[in-house]
Amino acid sequence: MMTGTIETTGNISAEKGGSIILQCHLSSTTAQVTQVNWEQQDQLLAICNADLGWHISPSFKDRVAPGPGLGLTLQSLTVNDTGEYFCIYHTYPDGTYTGRIFLEVLESSVAEHGARFQIP
């Protein structure tokens, strides 16, 4: 039975040209995290494998940095980066947990962080 929950940074906004940290946290389970995938819609951004470490997709190599922790830092943001981002936790023995973050990249200098929320 899957008992864990993923807490994410929720709906967030950031300025064009700036950077943002995408963060998820898996709690309420003793399952072992074997891999965390970060995806934007259907595109793979990065993967952190528990044994081998981080792999950054070549197309994002210059704009994505691993961490902090299992999070992901997006740099040199453009308005095209606006959209849904998913953290996918592969665990044993529970299976897969998915968290969702919506990022809005703003032209203006007003960029407020949304509240955190949980996905069971």
Epitope: Q35, I47, N49, L52, G53, W54, H55, I56, S57, P66
Partner: antibody
């Protein structure tokens, strides 16, 4: 041409130290994981350890048999990999190879790790 | 750590024959992290197969790999004189990376 060339092997007494070098050329060194693998005379291959790439802050990991005695480092500005071997034992006698690790993900997030480029090896003999 | 057991230890065959080499893992491994290498006397190992079944660049199609879970196979469909060598399997996940003990393919 993608190439790896090891150097620094030789004869050393038990308890002694030795530093091996591996010079890389023909590829973007900082992007790659680098492994050390050894082969004792007449025996099979044994993984010694690795250093990860720049994106992984060059973290290292080691086989249990060498942990605490061997240290892997790299200098990306010189395209060079190193293996510092301390407290050497007779059982460390082997040919030491450096190899380029390929770590990536293909379609369907299918991960791969293998060593696709190898040096010619350098011989380390630990004997009194 | 994962122990990879290769069998047979030695395979005595003639050129033109089919060679079937086995690699058995002590526990399940992901096939995508399973590779095969060839090594000739006095030479460094050479990558043959990665991801259990994908041939490395420049490797002839007489070499093929298969398997999943704990059982993997390297097949050489028709042995050429240059194929007589020692073959090693290797797994990378879970850590630590380990090699099998090798199978020597010798001329009968």
């Amino acid at each position: 041409e993608v190439q790896l060339v090891e150097s620094g092997g030789g004869l050393v007494q038990p308890g002694g130290s030795l530093r091996l070098s591996c010079a890389a050329s023909g590829f973007t060194f900082s992007d790659h994981y680098m492994d050390w693998v050894r082969q004792a005379p007449g025996k099979g291959l044994e993984w010694v350890g690795r250093t990860r790439n720049k994106a992984n802050s060059y973290t290292t990991e080691y086989a249990a048999s060498v942990k605490g005695r061997f240290t892997i480092s790299r200098d990306d500005s010189k395209n060079s990999l190193y293996l510092q071997m301390n407290s050497l034992k007779t059982e460390d006698t082997a040919v030491y190879y450096c190899a380029r690790g390929q770590y990536y993900y293909g379609s369907s997030s299918r991960g791969y790790y293998y060593m696709d480029v190898w040096g010619q090896g350098t011989t380390v003999t630990v004997s009194s | 750590e994962i122990v990879l057991t290769q069998s047979p230890g030695t395979l005595s065959l003639s050129p033109g024959e089919r060679a079937t080499l086995s690699c058995r893992a002590s526990q399940s491994v992901s096939s995508s992290y399973l590779a095969w290498y060839q090594q000739k006397p006095g030479q460094a190992p050479r990558l043959l197969i990665y991801g259990a079944s994908s041939r490395a660049t420049g490797i002839p199609d007489r070499f093929s790999g298969s398997g999943s879970g704990t059982d993997f196979t390297l097949t050489i469909s028709r042995l050429e004189p240059e194929d007589f060598a020692v073959y090693y399997c290797q797994q990378a996940v879970p850590s630590p990376l380990t090699f099998g003990g090798g199978t020597k393919v010798e001329i009968k």
